[in-house]
């Protein structure tokens, strides 16, 4: 999902320590930044979230807030501290004039300031059938485990807790943080105020139409009667959950955020903190028929972001708009005409559509998976959701052409059994943001903290790229792709896997002098090859064709163009075994694929040769896809021949561990 480069406005104001009365002036040269929502109508000027540096204590936050008030007062400005954050993010929420931003940015401990903005509800019986494996009858949907060990927090509108569908299952907390409704003549009607939240609570855990019929829920009101809330209100809600978790630790927690606003650095940061505290967050991708990376919390990498499909597994159209898409979406789920509790009466039911409904399905599935395996980490849960999804059923023609390759073709489904998936080596594909077109532009794809980066590839629509490589960043490997002169930009594609007790390293061979091409292998005892990458400095690799087939007995070897440096990802993990599988096509083809067989998981995907007519390589589920330039432009010379190279791995250790458990 989103890196650090979301599409939002950023005003960087250089700090100078000339402000009067600053006892703790920031170090010279540091800059605090100001952010605001890129969607103008959603901005809420006059209210600001001041985010302080990570290690700032509550007392320092309070002192900084007081200092801001004092200095503002000296300039004749009134300010009001609305909330002091602690427990999730250090900082405070302040109502003040925008004139004071420059002053506020110079305060000690300030990391960045974000103007508040709006968030919105994302809603406009086949659904249980789609997520249910064939062995369950849809009309008597009896989930294998109803999610009874899990608590699901719902941040939404108020709800009708005495509805027959959810009575006794939802605890309404006393948390409420909502903006005033728009319009002077707005009439609050209880049934309308409760509509969105009641429906979603029913989709998650309702007795008749719910996914996780055993899950208990807690509701927080962050959306008003018009389905509108604020980033700040959502932040305070997330902080409330974190504090509740600390006061009374329970079993696994799932937080459902069926709302979306413009890209928000602070909302994404809060989601990241909560996720790293062991909470599973599930959110709506958004109903804007747009790139989900432009919205929050959909763009937060730690959040499970869900798009909406219909009964035919097609992306949902909602009026002139529809489900969001793109690399920030993790998977899709039923989100059209979903039957659920209606707040019109305690025995009323109605259908609603949207990515909120889709997210509620995934929250329900997550609750059931966590109830069956309470020790699952967020990374393990996400990988399982992806693994058990229906693959390649969505008609990608609905998505804009440039988004098709980035959007996961996955529709959420329950595992055939909620136990016993532990033997599987789980991997997923993570796409970076687009690098941009400048000559030296790069793109970085990262895995989650407890995933291993097992391979790295790159892709460019123009074919102008300089390959990719794995490099260490902050103690973890990342995948970096390089744009080339005249290129329109590149994507880095990371293959992120769950490999307990793994010890992985990257072995590099510089460009070879000899004409045979560059080679690198895993020379350490017990290390196996999981991925190959190649990176070159020249603008065009030309047509040199290295030997495609490896010498017998050399499976742990990457080969590449003589002008490229070759990088081998070599891993040691208990019982890990890998093999190389190649599929070469002598005639030019726009796409060459090779898949790993049943029981093996694709960890590496690369192309041979690395010549410039190859657009790149990427993994789709268990298939390695190599894309080349339009056949008509390459002609039918030998340059058109391309080989897709897959590295397929499995873990005997995981398989044995799983057998011992059964």
């Amino acid at each position: 999902q989103e890196d650090e480069d979301g599409d939002y406005e950023e005003l960087v104001l250089a700090l100078r320590s000339e402000e009067d009365g600053l006892a703790e002036a920031p170090e010279h040269g540091t800059t605090a930044t100001f952010h605001r929502c890129a969607k103008d109508p959603w901005r809420l000027p006059g209210t600001y979230v001041v985010v302080l540096k990570e290690e700032t204590h509550l007392s320092q936050s309070e002192r900084t807030a007081r200092r801001l008030q004092a200095q503002a007062a000296r300039r004749g400005y009134l300010t009001k501290i609305l909330h002091v954050f602690h427990g999730l993010l250090p900082g405070f929420l302040v109502k003040m004039s925008g004139d004071l931003l420059e002053l506020a940015l110079k305060l000690p401990h300030v990391d960045y300031i974000e103007e508040d903005s709006s968030v919105f509800a994302q809603s406009i019986p086949w659904n249980l059938e789609r997520i249910t494996p064939p062995r369950y009858r849809a009309d008597e949907y009896q989930p294998p485990d109803g999610g009874s060990l899990v608590e699901v927090y719902l941040l939404d509108t108020s709800i009708q807790s005495d509805h027959r569908e959810i009575e006794g299952r939802v605890m309404v907390t006393d948390f409420e943080n909502v903006p005033e409704e728009d319009g002077t003549r707005f009439h609050r009607q209880a049934s309308k105020c409760d509509s969105h939240g009641t429906h979603l609570a029913g989709v998650v855990s309702g007795r008749d139409a719910g996914v996780a019929k055993g899950a208990s829920m807690r509701s927080l009101r962050v959306l008003n009667c018009q389905g509108k809330g604020t980033v700040s209100g959502t932040l305070i809600g997330l902080e409330f959950i974190r504090k509740s978790q600390l006061v009374q630790p329970v079993g696994p927690l799932v937080v459902l955020l069926p709302l979306a606003g413009g890209y928000s650095r602070v909302l994404n940061a809060a989601c990241q903190r909560l996720a790293r505290a062991g909470v599973v967050l599930v959110t709506a991708a958004g109903n804007f028929r747009d790139d989900a990376c432009l919205y929050s919390p959909a763009s937060a990498p730690e959040v499970i972001t869900v798009g909406a499909t219909n009964a035919q597994d097609q992306p949902v159209t909602l009026g002139t708009l529809g489900t969001n898409f793109g690399r920030c979406v993790d998977l899709f789920a039923p989100g059209e005409d979903i039957i659920g509790a209606s707040s019109d009466c305690s025995t009323c039911f109605v259908s609603q559509s949207g990515t909120s409904q889709a997210a509620a399905h995934v929250a329900g599935i997550a609750a059931m998976m966590l109830s069956a395996e309470p020790e699952l980490t967020l990374a393990e849960l996400r990988q399982r959701l992806i693994h058990f999804s229906a693959k390649d059923v969505i008609n990608e023609a609905w998505f804009p052409e440039d988004q098709r390759v980035l959007t996961p073709n996955l529709v959420a489904a329950l595992p055939p059994s909620t136990h016993g998936a532990g033997w599987q080596l789980f991997c997923r594909t993570v796409w970076s943001a687009h690098s941009g077109p400048t000559r030296m532009a790069t793109a970085v794809a990262r895995c989650a903290p407890d995933e291993e980066l097992l391979s790295c590839s790159s892709f460019s629509r123009s074919g102008k790229r300089r390959g990719e490589r794995m490099e260490a960043q902050g103690g973890k490997l990342v995948c970096r792709a390089h744009n080339a002169f005249g290129g329109e930009g590149v994507y880095a594609i990371a293959r992120c896997c769950l490999l307990p007790q793994a010890n992985c390293s990257v072995h590099t061979a510089p460009p070879a002098e000899a004409s045979m091409g560059t080679r690198v292998h895993c020379h350490q005892q017990g290390h196996v090859l999981t991925g190959c990458s190649s990176h070159w400095e020249v603008e065009d690799l030309g047509t040199h064709k290295p030997p495609v087939l490896r010498p017998r007995g050399q499976p742990n070897q990457c080969v590449g163009h003589r002008e490229a440096s070759i990088h081998a990802s070599c891993c040691h993990a208990p019982g890990l075994e890998c093999k190389v599988k190649e599929h070469g096509i002598p005639a030019p083809q726009e796409q060459v694929t090779v898949a790993c067989e049943e029981g093996w998981t694709l960890t590496g995907c690369s192309a041979l040769p690395g010549t410039s007519h190859v657009l790149g390589a990427y993994a789709v589920d268990n298939t390695c896809v190599v894309r080349s330039r339009d056949v008509s432009t390459t002609g039918s010379t030998s340059e058109g021949a391309v080989t897709a190279v897959a590295i397929c791995c499995r873990s005997r250790h995981l398989a044995q561990a799983s057998q011992e458990l059964q």
């Epitope: 008749d208 009466c345 109605v350």
Partner: antibody
């Protein structure tokens, strides 16, 4: 397969009592509201009573409230209808039904109760 | 109690015809309305719940519409097996109440 089987009804004297039972199978009984509906021969349907999942909440047709009691035993998957001070106008076929989406989606085959001297 | 009125006790139709049965509530019941089919000697069978949602396994020639006080049940093309009595029932507030039923017969 969802099944609802009512106990045998029969002929009873006016003023006497009778307890109907309905044995459920093929679904998680405790997850559903259950109801009794009756039908006078050649006439329409009349809802009698319903009961929530755990038996803590019941509703009745006003005119029957004082004489009929609906109850359930979730351990045995059985729904009951205790009828007392029976009158000739209680003569009907009694159906037990499961409620889903607040409508009655599965019905028993019905049992005939005749109140006559 | 909410009174449900099915104005036609009988409706005559021909096979293949489209037929609509109406039901009126004495007060607003939102969309909390179900339709049942009952054949002689059989228990009622749920067709439509919440005014317009077809229950599992019900053929798509059966549709329901309406909200508030006025509801309609439609069979788009009558088949021989559709000859039965059709009842509406509100599930807005207890006591649940049924309409008097409409018997569908062939002309």
């Amino acid at each position: 397969e969802v099944k609802l089987v009512e106990s045998e009804g029969g002929l009873v004297q006016p003023g006497s009592s009778m307890k109907l039972s309905c044995t459920a199978s093929g679904f998680t009984f405790s997850d559903y509201y259950m109801a009794w509906v009756r039908q006078v021969p050649e006439k329409g349907l009349e809802w009698v009573a319903n009961i929530n999942y755990d038996g803590s909440n019941t509703s009745y047709l006003d005119s029957l409230k004082s004489r009929f009691i609906i109850s359930r035993d979730n351990a045995k998957n059985i729904l009951y209808l205790q009828m007392s001070s029976l009158k000739s106008e209680d003569t009907a076929t009694y159906y037990c039904a499961r409620e889903k989406f607040a409508a009655m989606d599965y019905w028993g085959q019905g049992t005939s109760v005749t109140v006559s001297s | 109690d909410i009174v449900m009125t099915q104005s036609h006790k009988f409706m005559s139709t021909s096979f293949g015809d489209r037929v609509s049965i109406t039901c009126k509530a004495s007060q607003d019941v939102s969309n909390a309305l179900a339709w049942y089919q009952q054949k002689p000697g059989h228990s009622p069978k749920l067709l439509i719940f919440s005014a317009s949602y077809r229950y599992t396994g019900v053929p798509d020639r059966f549709t329901g519409s309406g909200s508030g006080t006025d509801f309609t049940f439609t069979i788009s093309s009558v088949q021989a097996e559709d000859l039965a009595v059709y009842y509406c029932q509100q599930h807005y507030s207890t006591p649940w109440t049924f309409g008097g039923g409409t018997k569908l017969e062939i002309k």
